[in-house]
């Protein structure tokens, strides 16, 4: 079957809502950047629909996206990262809808990893550490991190701490004793770039110790 729409197909297409959103990931694979777009409406029939980006590219005028199930994806070194590009949904060579976007304003960082929590008995606190691939990157190096933790039994009662470093101290006195906690972290560009929260890191689980009363203390 031809990838080109018949006139009837175009008329039908024009009735649909082709709103879409995109995010970029810079230096996601060595010096390669990626751009991912998807339709806002998950029920859009994507047969014959293509995405194309034009402008603010190096050495080429336009690039076509690859389709992976319901998302559209490019991995390339050819993003100039200066100025606005035009991203269009096309059918049969005709643009249905377009957006002008500066790719440095829709950056989604990679998820943090290696999250761990160490209890320091003498200090009566928990040291939370994690890693991020962005420390090694040329562009998106400065991130704000959101550490979220909750007592496992409190399903929706998340506590959040924002920080720019990859180390956080939680005081034992601010946590319930003898309780299981879940903790996770995500990142967002904080300076020079704009965009979206990363995916959450895998959760880490830790248990708080019971309160040990000193010999002189009353129950």
């Amino acid at each position: 079957e031809s990838g080109y729409a018949q006139n009837g197909d175009l008329e039908d297409a024009e009735l649909d809502d082709y709103s879409f959103s995109c995010y970029s990931q810079l230096e996601v694979n060595g010096s390669q950047h990626s751009l991912t777009c998807a339709f806002e409406d998950p029920d859009v029939n994507t047969t014959n629909l293509e995405f194309e980006i034009c402008g603010a590219l190096v050495e080429v005028k336009c690039l076509s996206f690859r389709k992976l199930q319901e998302i559209y994806f490019i991995e390339t070194k050819k993003f100039l990262l200066i100025g606005k590009s035009n991203i269009c949904v096309k059918v049969g060579g005709k643009s249905l809808t377009c957006k002008k976007i500066d790719l440095t304003t829709i950056v989604k960082p990679e998820a943090p990893f290696d999250l761990s929590v160490i209890y320091r008995e003498g200090a009566n606190d928990f040291v939370v550490t994690f890693n991020t691939s962005h420390l090694q990157k040329k562009y998106v190096k400065v991130l704000m991190h959101d550490v979220a933790y909750r007592q496992e039994k409190d399903e929706n009662k998340w506590m959040h701490v924002n920080l720019s470093s990859t180390k956080l101290t939680l005081l034992q006195r601010n946590l319930q004793p003898e309780a299981m906690y879940e903790i996770k972290v995500r990142s967002i560009p904080d300076h020079y770039f704009k965009g979206f929260w990363s995916e959450w890191s895998p959760s880490y689980y830790f248990r708080t110790p019971e309160i040990n009363n000193s010999p002189g203390e009353m129950d």
């Epitope: 603010a56 200066i82 100025g83 606005k84 035009n86 300076h191 020079y192």
Partner: nanobody, 118 residues
Framework: DVQLVESGGGLVQAGGSLRLSCESS????????MGWFRQAPGKEREFLAA????????HYSDSVKGRFTISRDNAKNTVYLQMNSLRAEDTGRYYC???????????WGQGTQVTVSS
């Protein structure tokens, strides 16, 4: 009504330095890419350098890489071109441009003249 005003040009000896400034009165300056170009007598206008909205990303032509540096101050609505190790062939009129939108610069200044004597 004037939107981009370049300054800092002049006569300089080969090997010397100059710093050009371009002040913008365009309201979207802090979210716009900026660029510097030059036009030598009898030649086409050539791209020299560009900088992204935040200053984090820069791009240079091979002819000025390592000698010229583009920077910006979003609080002052100004973009700069620091030019070192100037050569006679750098002589020309220097223009700044704003808002690189799908491969077209939307706004242009009137330019400032730079003359490098050997």
């Amino acid at each position: 009504d004037v939107q981009l005003v370049e300054s800092g040009g002049g006569l300089v000896q080969a090997g010397g330095s100059l710093r050009l400034s371009c002040e913008s009165s365009i309201s979207t300056f802090s979210s716009d890419a900026m660029g510097w170009f030059r036009q030598a007598p009898g030649k086409e206008r050539e791209f020299l350098a560009a900088i992204g909205w935040s200053g984090a990303v820069t791009h240079y032509s091979d002819s000025v890489k390592g000698r010229f540096t583009i920077s910006r101050d979003n609080a002052k609505n100004t973009v700069y071109l620091q030019m070192n190790s100037l050569r006679a062939e750098d002589t020309g009129r220097y223009y700044c441009a704003e808002d690189y939108d799908t491969d077209v610069w939307q706004y242009w200044g009137q330019g400032t003249q730079v003359t490098v004597s050997s």
